[in-house]
Amino acid sequence: HTAAQDNCTCPTNKMTVCSPDGPGGRCQCRALGSGVAVDCSTLTSKCLLLKARMSAPKNARTLVRPNEHALVDNDGLYDPDCDPEGRFKARQCNQTSVCWCVNSVGVRRTDKGDLSLRCDELVRTHHILIDLRHRPTASAFNHSDLDAELRRLFRERYRLHPKFVAAVHYEQPTIQIELRQNTSQKAAGDVDIGDAAYYFERDVKGESLFQGRGGLDLRVRGEPLQVERTLIYYLDEIPPKFSMKRLT
C-alpha cells in the first residue's frame, strides 16, 4: 500500500474505483457500472452517474411542467446507454425492446416506441430552471446576497462558469436558478449545465456525489438555507415531439 495509492482517489465522484495503473503509473479512476475512465478534476457526466447508480435504485420522481415545451424527469431511474465520452445516446431502450429518444440530460423527449424508432441526433438541453422552496426563516434572504452565494456555489462546488448562471429569482420562499448554455457557448472543458444541475439535485437530497465531503452546507450571510423541495425543468434547443394523446 503506497502513498500513490492513498492519493489516488476521485474527489468529484465517489462512485468510482481508482488505482495507479494509468499511463506512467498515474492514477486512473473508472466509473462503477460502465468501467469508463473519468476525469476527476471535473464533474462526471450524468449518464455515467445514472449507470453507476443502478446498483442502488431509488424511487422514481414525478415533477410538474411549467409550459408546453418544458420537460421533467417523470420516468425516474433507468439504466442508460452512454457513448464513449459519457454522453447519453440519443436513443434509449429497455430490456423489453421499448425505445425512446432523450435529450442531453437523459430525459425522454418523444413517445415510447419499438426498436424501429429513430433518434437522429442528441438534442441539447440549453435552458434549465431549478425551482427550490426553502424552509421558513425569520426574514427573507437578501436577493443580491442569495444571488452571489448561489453563483459562488455553482462555480466552486460544481465548477460551472458564472456566465452560465443566467439569473437567480427570489420570491420568498421560492428560489429559481436559471442555467443557460447553448451548444455554441460550451467550450471544451466547460462543465455541462445538465451535469451541474444533477450534482446540485443530488446534493439537495443529501446524496452528495463528491468523495469524502460533507453534504451541502448552504449559507447566506451565515444564515442556513435549507431546501424543502426541488423541481427541475428542462428546455431543449428543439422542442420535444410527443403525440397529442400525451398532452391531454
Epitope: 492519493n7 476521485c10 498515474r26 476525469d39 453563483r151 466552486e156
Partner: antibody, heavy 122, light 109 residues
C-alpha cells in the same frame, strides 16, 4: 517535498524546447494541478498552463499560449512543457508550481521550483 | 478578467505598516492568494483564501477582503520584508486570463 525544473538555456528565434518539472518527496498521482508560470527579466508573473495530475489529465492554457505551448504529464513523477516558435519575448525564468487543491478555480501555489532560465536569442 | 494591484511600489521605515490593494474586475469570492518574491527566488505563498495564513508565515501579514476588493497588510515591517508582492486568483482560469496582479515592490527604509 520539492520541485525542480530543467531544460532551460539558449534557444534561437523560431526554435523549440521542452522543459521538465520533476518532484521529489511526493508523487504526481495526487488529486492536484501542476502549473507553469513564467517571469520575464524585471517583470511580473505570468501564468502559462496547468494540468491535472490525478485521473483525467485536464489542461488549461493562457489565451496567448494556446497552440504554441503544450503541457503534458506522461508519468507520475514529471510534468513537461513544450514550446515552439519561440521569440525574444519568451525570454524568461520558467517556474513549475504545485496547486494546493483539486479545484482548478480555487487554486493557489504552495510549492514552487527554483525556476529555469530560457533565453531566446540568435 | 483582470487583477489590478496598487501601488506598484511603496517605501516604509522599519516598524511601519504597508497596505497593498488588489482589485478583481469580477467577483472571485474569497479565492485570492498573496505571494512574496525576493530577487533570484521563486514566489512564496503567504496567504490563501483571501485571509488564511500559510504555514510558517508570521501573523504580521494579514489578508482581508472578498468579492472584488482585497488587501494585504504588513505591520511591524522588518528588513526581511523587502520584496515584491503579488496577488493571484485562478477563479477565471478557463477564460485563459492571467490571474496574477502586476506586483508591488516593498522597500524597507
Amino acid at each position: 517535498q520539492q520541485l525542480e525544473e530543467s531544460g532551460g538555456g539558449l534557444v534561437k528565434p523560431e526554435g523549440s524546447l521542452t522543459l521538465t518539472c520533476k518532484g521529489s518527496g511526493f508523487d504526481f498521482s495526487g488529486t492536484y494541478w501542476m502549473w507553469w508560470v513564467r517571469q520575464a527579466p524585471g517583470k511580473g508573473l505570468e501564468w502559462i498552463a496547468c494540468i491535472y495530475v490525478g485521473s483525467g489529465s485536464s489542461t488549461y492554457y493562457a489565451s496567448w499560449a494556446k497552440g504554441r505551448f503544450t503541457i503534458s504529464s506522461t508519468s507520475s513523477t514529471a510534468v513537461t512543457l513544450q514550446a515552439t516558435s519561440l521569440t525574444a519575448a519568451d525570454t524568461a525564468t520558467y517556474f513549475c508550481a504545485r496547486g494546493a487543491t483539486n479545484n482548478v478555480f480555487m487554486n493557489y501555489f504552495n510549492l514552487w521550483g527554483p525556476g529555469t532560465l530560457v533565453t531566446v536569442s540568435s | 478578467f483582470e487583477m489590478t494591484q496598487t501601488p506598484s511600489s511603496v517605501s516604509e521605515p522599519v516598524g511601519g505598516t504597508v497596505t497593498i490593494k488588489c482589485q478583481a474586475s469580477e467577483d472571485i469570492s474569497s479565492n485570492l492568494g498573496w505571494y512574496q518574491q525576493k530577487p533570484g527566488q521563486p514566489p512564496k505563498l503567504l496567504i490563501y483564501g483571501a485571509s488564511t495564513l500559510a504555514s510558517g508565515v508570521p501573523s504580521r501579514f494579514k489578508g482581508s477582503g472578498s468579492g472584488t476588493e482585497f488587501t494585504l497588510t504588513i505591520s511591524d515591517l522588518e528588513c526581511a520584508d523587502a520584496a515584491t508582492y503579488y496577488c493571484q486568483t485562478s477563479y477565471y482560469i478557463d477564460d485563459g486570463v492571467n490571474g496574477f496582479g502586476g506586483g508591488t515592490e516593498v522597500v524597507v527604509k
